[in-house]
């Protein structure tokens, strides 16, 4: 088992909104749960966009999940990762 590296980035989306993206890379096996949460509660499926789980060329895998949030509410949002029985949460950078 190889645990993922998780990286959270932000980019301007539209006035008053930002897109936050959570990327997981370098993990094996390919089964992973990646989800955005607000106040510790998983966001609805329809408000998130997921990338495919793809091989990264090193025998491991990568994927991502993104969502759009209101600027100024970043502290309420965290990316939740679960892989091979381990889990972690990752905040939006300021």
């Amino acid at each position: 088992t190889v645990p993922p590296m998780v990286n959270v980035t932000r980019s301007e989306a539209s006035e008053g909104n930002i897109t936050v993206t959570c990327r997981a890379s370098g993990f094996y096996p390919w089964n992973i749960t990646l989800s955005w949460r607000q106040d510790g509660v998983s966001l609805s499926h329809d408000t998130q966009q997921w990338g495919d789980v793809l091989p990264d060329g090193n025998g491991t895998y990568q994927t991502w999940v993104a969502t759009r949030i209101c600027q100024g509410e970043e502290q309420r949002f965290t990316c939740y990762m679960e892989h091979s029985g381990n889990h972690s949460t990752h905040p939006v950078p300021s």
């Epitope: 989800s35 949460r37 607000q38 106040d39 510790g40 509660v41 998983s42 609805s44 499926h45 329809d46 509410e73 502290q75 309420r76 939740y80 949460t89």
Partner: antibody
């Protein structure tokens, strides 16, 4: 993780209902959302709202005009205030922790009757 | 709000029976479906979350399945301690909503 509700069992119509949820075994500022749910006679469950670990609140739109959820982080407690109650607010009120997809720990509930 | 319809509202089965409870949403809830057990004393416990994941400490005789709008909870071998009311909950679309409950009794 344990949650325990407390408050008056009888409230008069038009008054405010105030309940406390005492949490042990986990800090309410650590993570997750801290909820109030009620169960009417006949078993129907209704989600009232929550206060998140950051202190932000989210309410059921059907109750938003009457409800307030607050907290006391020093006592690891959170509170429900429901204003202008009527007999239709008679129910058993539960507090619960919402972790990721589901409410994984619940209190035992406290019964509230609204009657003059 | 999303409406959750649970069937049956009550059932009576023998010890060791396989019991299935159904829950239908009036729109797709994308696997955001949880099952809870409420004992006669009012205590509520999470059994299954995200359609099929078993909460820690829950016996393996409980399982969940489904997709889209239709979901089910199965008790593989009914035991006396399973006498309770079971509720489904959707968490995909705020506000979260619950089914009306299924009361399980022993014949």
């Amino acid at each position: 993780v344990q949650l325990q509700e407390s408050g008056p069992g009888l409230v008069k119509p038009s008054q405010s209902l105030s309940l406390t949820c005492n949490v042990t075994g986990y800090s309410i500022t650590g993570d997750y959302a801290w909820n109030w749910i009620r169960q009417f006679p006949g078993n129907k469950l209704e989600w009232i709202g929550y206060i998140g670990y950051t202190g932000s609140t989210t309410y059921n739109p059907s109750l938003k005009s009457r409800v307030s959820i607050t907290r006391d982080t020093s006592k690891n407690q959170f509170f429900l205030q429901l204003n202008s109650v009527t007999p239709e607010d008679t129910a058993t009120y539960y507090c619960a922790r919402w972790r990721n997809w589901a409410m994984d720990y619940w209190g035992l509930g406290t019964s509230v009757t609204v009657s003059s | 709000d999303i409406q959750m319809t649970q069937t049956p509202s009550s059932l009576s089965a023998s010890l060791g029976d396989r019991v299935t409870i159904s829950c239908r949403a009036n729109q797709d809830i994308s696997h955001y479906l949880n099952w809870y057990q409420q004992k006669p004393d009012g205590a509520v416990k999470l059994l299954i979350y995200y359609t099929s994941r078993i909460h820690s400490g829950v016996p393996s005789r409980f399982s969940g399945s489904g997709s889209g709008t239709d979901y089910s909870l199965t008790i593989a071998n009914l035991e006396q301690e399973d006498v309770a009311t079971y509720f489904c909950q959707q968490g995909n679309t705020p506000p979260t909503t619950f089914g009306g409950g299924t009361k399980v009794e022993i014949k």
